[in-house]
Interface confidence: low
């Protein structure tokens, strides 16, 4: 029976992921019952990715490690639409680390997942980045210009945003 074997495969995949995420929330993609896309509970989903807002305050290093333990990375923002989705889940009085850093302090910004840094798709606050010693990026809210990015010292603890690809079962 086709449906039975598909269900068995799904269950074995779910067991495989359980070591990282005890609970997954899955939805059917389109009209085809064969394709389910899942995010860990209580992560949120947008397009082909899952997002988790980590409210623990940690350095950039520890924030990235925290994401990687969950099979994710600090968030890489590729589009305005993606950022608009993410900010719906953020608190205005907090700052959140992004997966964007400038390790050499030479304004050579790099995303953690190796996505090329594209100056045309950046959302820096006006006047930012502004300090060569501030080598990690956060997203925060400024009343004058709403949500945008700022460079800060990497060791200063902040909240963070993790992102991972959806799990397809």
């Amino acid at each position: 029976n086709f449906m039975y074997s598909k269900t068995v495969k799904r269950l074995s995949k779910l067991r495989e992921y359980q070591q990282y995420h005890p609970s997954l929330t899955c939805v059917m993609e389109g009209k085809d019952i064969e394709d389910w896309s899942c995010c860990p509970t209580p992560w949120t989903s947008f397009q082909s990715s899952c997002y988790f807002i980590s409210t623990g305050m940690q350095s950039w290093t520890k924030s990235q490690k925290n994401c990687s333990v969950m099979g994710a990375d600090l968030v890489v923002i590729n589009t305005r639409e993606e950022q608009d989705f993410i900010i719906q889940n953020l608190k205005r009085n907090s700052s959140y680390f992004l997966g964007l850093s400038d390790p050499g302090g030479r304004r050579h910004w790099q995303w953690v997942d190796q996505t090329p840094y594209n100056e045309n798709v950046t959302f820096w606050h006006s006047g930012e980045p502004n300090n060569l010693d501030e080598r990690c990026a956060i997203i925060n809210f400024r009343s004058s210009e709403e949500w945008g990015w700022n460079d800060i010292h990497c060791h200063v603890p902040q909240k963070s945003i993790c992102k991972m690809k959806k799990i397809y079962i």
């Epitope: 850093s101 390790p103 953690v112 990690c136 990497c154």
Partner: nanobody
Framework: QVQLQESGGGLVQAGGSLRLSCAVS????????MGWFRQARGKEREFVAA????????FYTDSVKGRFAISRDIAKNTVYLQMNSLKPEDTAVYYC????????????????WGQGTQVTVSS
Amino acid sequence: QVQLQESGGGLVQAGGSLRLSCAVSGRTFSSYAMGWFRQARGKEREFVAAVEWSSGSTFYTDSVKGRFAISRDIAKNTVYLQMNSLKPEDTAVYYCAGDHTGKLVFSKTSDYWGQGTQVTVSS
């Protein structure tokens, strides 16, 4: 598929030198970085040094600064770790790694690892 192959490990007396090599095949890391990590028996793997592939910028852990030098040869797709004034506490398996600079330097993690080469420093 990325493959990293280390060589150059061995047994050396305290105060001596060794040069490790790591040959990269399968892809180049362009604007990313190559690094060395080490793992002593019973301890966690720790970051040693990294070099940014395009700019040549180097990064070291404090305990090896002034003694170890990392470099890369773009034409040969190889990264080197010159280790001088070796100490018994440098004894470990040394692993080559390649990844985004921020991941190597800040997070001390990588998605790409070599098999490792043993370095033993006797007193």
